[in-house]
Interface confidence: medium
């Protein structure tokens, strides 16, 4: 017996009625006395509703189910589920038995729209640029769990420092609270979008914050103009200073270091104490020098991924900020030179000379020269590959026709460190092998 149900889940809003469609094709002469119809929960086999011995046996499921009795004889075995709850979600099996037997399962997907988010700000008074605030976006009584996205006023995603929690109430409906921690700029719009993935329903809220500027003028924050260059694996100091006024105490100071582009928090000093590193526990302040206006940040065991711009925000009564660039570098190893072919070489032979130098950063510049210092630019192929640490291995290949004799040298330059590493190979006019045999 062929039993038909919808392939896609039946989506039902909490509190509404849902129809779980199920049908079969009755043969001529079919009467309801021959019909056994059973609806049950697919997983637990719990009885939901049944029609046997020619009559409706009623609901075994909280008295919230009904059959379409007037349509049963035409093969409509659908089940009506009233006042849908979250707990109803799942698979229901429709068993039909006449002389023969058939069954099929239909999925019920429960949903509830999320409310328009309410936005709250903490603190919400006397805000100044440079203050750290938490913006909370709350949306209620939705199902299933929501997806939450934050954006700035230009539509750019805000992904750093977001914490989202979702709590189900007794009915199984979720309240979602998403908290964005952000350092205020001169002004800004922050918006949160709460999506119900089943209903494809979006609820959004936004908040525009215009911090007050104090009339006394901004704090002047000083950082080096030039990038700070740091070797991979060493410690770097990102210098930042301000001029404290007479009577200044650390209790008045809010100091925040963050990544300029992503606004990710790196380190902070607020409420009179060091709040510690939010950046892989590799940062520290010079606490004994803070009161003198030294807001510098120490970054330990520098990695390639640290490269970029760091912003130093200083807020006392007023606010100031400045960005300092960190340029990461690593010296290239002395190049190793290989020759191919490397046996029985004669003038007129074409050879490839490979110059390899390892674990440098940033990408190298490679120059080839002959024995007189003249550049060799033709037939050079240079490739640079980064390893997991982001350090580059450089391989430069020179293809050349041997003269009577000649020296070929390769210079690998680190453009940041202005460090040159070079290697050379000398090929004489006699038949020879490389490297020369002892």
């Amino acid at each position: 017996l062929e039993v038909q149900v919808p392939e896609d889940p039946v989506v039902a809003l909490v509190g509404t009625d849902a129809t779980l469609r199920c049908s079969f094709s009755p043969e001529p002469g079919f009467s309801l006395a021959q019909l056994n119809l059973i609806w049950q929960l697919t997983d637990t086999k719990q009885l939901v509703h049944s029609f046997t011995e020619g009559r409706d046996q009623g609901s075994a499921y909280a008295n919230r189910t009904a059959l379409f009795l007037d349509l049963l004889a035409q093969g409509n075995a659908s089940l009506r589920l009233q006042r849908v709850r979250v707990a109803d979600e799942g698979s229901f099996t429709c068993f039909v038995s006449i002389r023969d037997f058939g069954s099929a399962a239909v999925s019920l997907q429960v949903a509830a729209p999320y409310s328009k988010p309410s936005m709250t700000l903490e603190p919400n008074k006397d805000l100044r640029p440079g203050d750290t605030v938490t913006i909370t976006c709350s949306s209620y009584r939705g199902y299933p769990e929501a997806e939450v996205f934050w954006q700035d006023g230009q539509g750019a995603p805000l992904t750093g420092n977001v914490t989202t929690s979702q709590m189900a109430n007794e009915q199984g409906l979720f309240d979602v609270h998403s908290v964005l921690r952000v350092v205020l700029g001169a002004n800004g719009t922050y918006s949160c979008l709460v999506r119900n993935p089943v209903l494809q329903q979006d609820a959004h809220g936004s908040i525009t914050i215009t911090p007050q500027r104090s009339p006394t003028g901004a704090v002047e924050v000083q950082v080096p103009e030039d990038p700070v260059v740091a070797l991979v694996g060493t410690d770097a100091t990102l210098r930042c200073s301000f001029s404290p006024e007479p009577g200044f105490s650390l209790a008045q100071l809010n100091l925040i270091w963050q990544l300029t582009d992503t606004k990710q928090l790196v380190h902070s000093f607020t409420e009179g104490r060091d709040q510690g590193s939010a950046y892989a526990n590799r940062t520290a302040l010079f606490l004994d020098l803070l009161a003198q206006g030294n807001a510098s940040l120490r970054l330990q065991r520098v990695r390639v991924a640290d490269e970029g711009s760091f912003t130093c925000f200083v807020s006392i009564r007023d606010f100031g900020s400045a960005a300092v660039s960190l340029q990461v570098a690593a010296p290239y190893s002395k190049p190793s030179m290989t020759l191919e072919p490397n046996k029985d070489l004669r003038p007129g032979d074409t050879v490839t000379i490979t110059c390899s130098s390892y674990r440098g950063y940033p990408e190298a510049e490679v120059f080839w020269q002959d024995g007189q210092g003249a550049p060799l630019t033709g037939n050079v192929t240079t490739s640079q590959m980064a390893n997991e640490q982001g350090l580059f291995d450089v391989h430069s290949v020179l293809r050349v026709v041997l003269g009577a004799n000649g020296t070929y040298s390769c210079l690998v330059r680190n453009p940041v460190l202005q460090q040159d590493a070079h290697g050379s190979v000398t090929i004489t006019g006699q038949p020879m092998t490389f490297p020369p045999e002892a």
């Epitope: 954006q151 750019a156 979008l193």
Partner: antibody
């Protein structure tokens, strides 16, 4: 009519730099961010970064960090994209595009006509 | 980085056919935009915010989806729809495009 008009085609040598301009008209230049997207011959679209002409805030795709500089001149409603240390793989059509919309939905609604940059020795 | 994978890469179709292009994101995104690019032209906005038609776009185009799976549908294809179609997200940095789906009219 809202328009973005880009500078003409450029032929450059490897290792050199190129600066492409994008002049906006028909709308308030400082109200929308300008993004730069490139397309290598026969390839898809690749985002390079954007600038907020009002605040001059920029954000770059990691791949171009350190090689691309985006600037904007409010007085002439012109955005600029400079790409340095050019290599042959940078041969592409470079587009500027206006990122428009309103919270929370945004999209590229106006594109420049594209500037072809050819890098060849 | 959220990677957008479009399928198919290429499709050859006859006029009046229905065409479906899918765009799958490597993690959940808030919405998807779609662009049409004809040879030697700049891209043009087609669908904004998953399902909203851009101004001047014929009603035979439609978009749907959520989470990680999004679809662009062209009902009753016309000859002028021969182009490459791209999906785009910016729910997470960096902004990314799909690799493109080229539609050829038979």
């Amino acid at each position: 009519e809202v328009q973005l008009v880009q500078s003409g085609a450029e032929v450059k040598k490897p290792g050199s730099s190129v600066k492409v301009s994008c002049k906006a008209s028909g709308y308030s230049f400082t109200s929308y961010t300008i993004h730069w997207v490139r397309q290598a011959p026969g390839q898809g679209l690749e985002w390079m970064g954007y600038i907020n002409p009002n605040s001059r805030n920029t954000d770059y795709a990691q791949k171009f960090q350190g090689r691309v500089t985006l600037t904007a001149d409010k007085s002439t409603s012109t955005a600029y994209m400079e790409l340095s240390s050019l290599r042959s793989e940078d041969t592409a059509v470079y587009y500027c595009a206006r990122y428009s919309g309103s919270t929370p939905y945004w999209y590229f609604d106006v594109w420049g006509q594209g500037t072809t940059v050819t890098v060849s020795s | 980085e959220i990677v957008l994978t479009q399928s198919p890469d290429f499709q050859s179709v006859t006029p009046k056919e229905k065409v479906t292009i899918t765009c799958r994101a490597s993690s959940s995104v808030s919405y998807m935009n779609w662009y049409q690019q004809k040879p030697d032209q700049s891209p043009k906005l087609l669908i904004k915010a998953t399902s909203n038609l851009a101004s001047g776009v014929p009603s035979r185009f439609s978009g749907s989806g959520s989470g990680t799976d999004f679809t662009l549908t062209i009902n009753s294809l016309e000859a002028e729809d021969a182009a490459t179609y791209y999906c785009q997200q910016w729910s997470s940095n960096p902004l990314t495009f799909g690799q493109g789906t080229k539609l050829e009219i038979k």
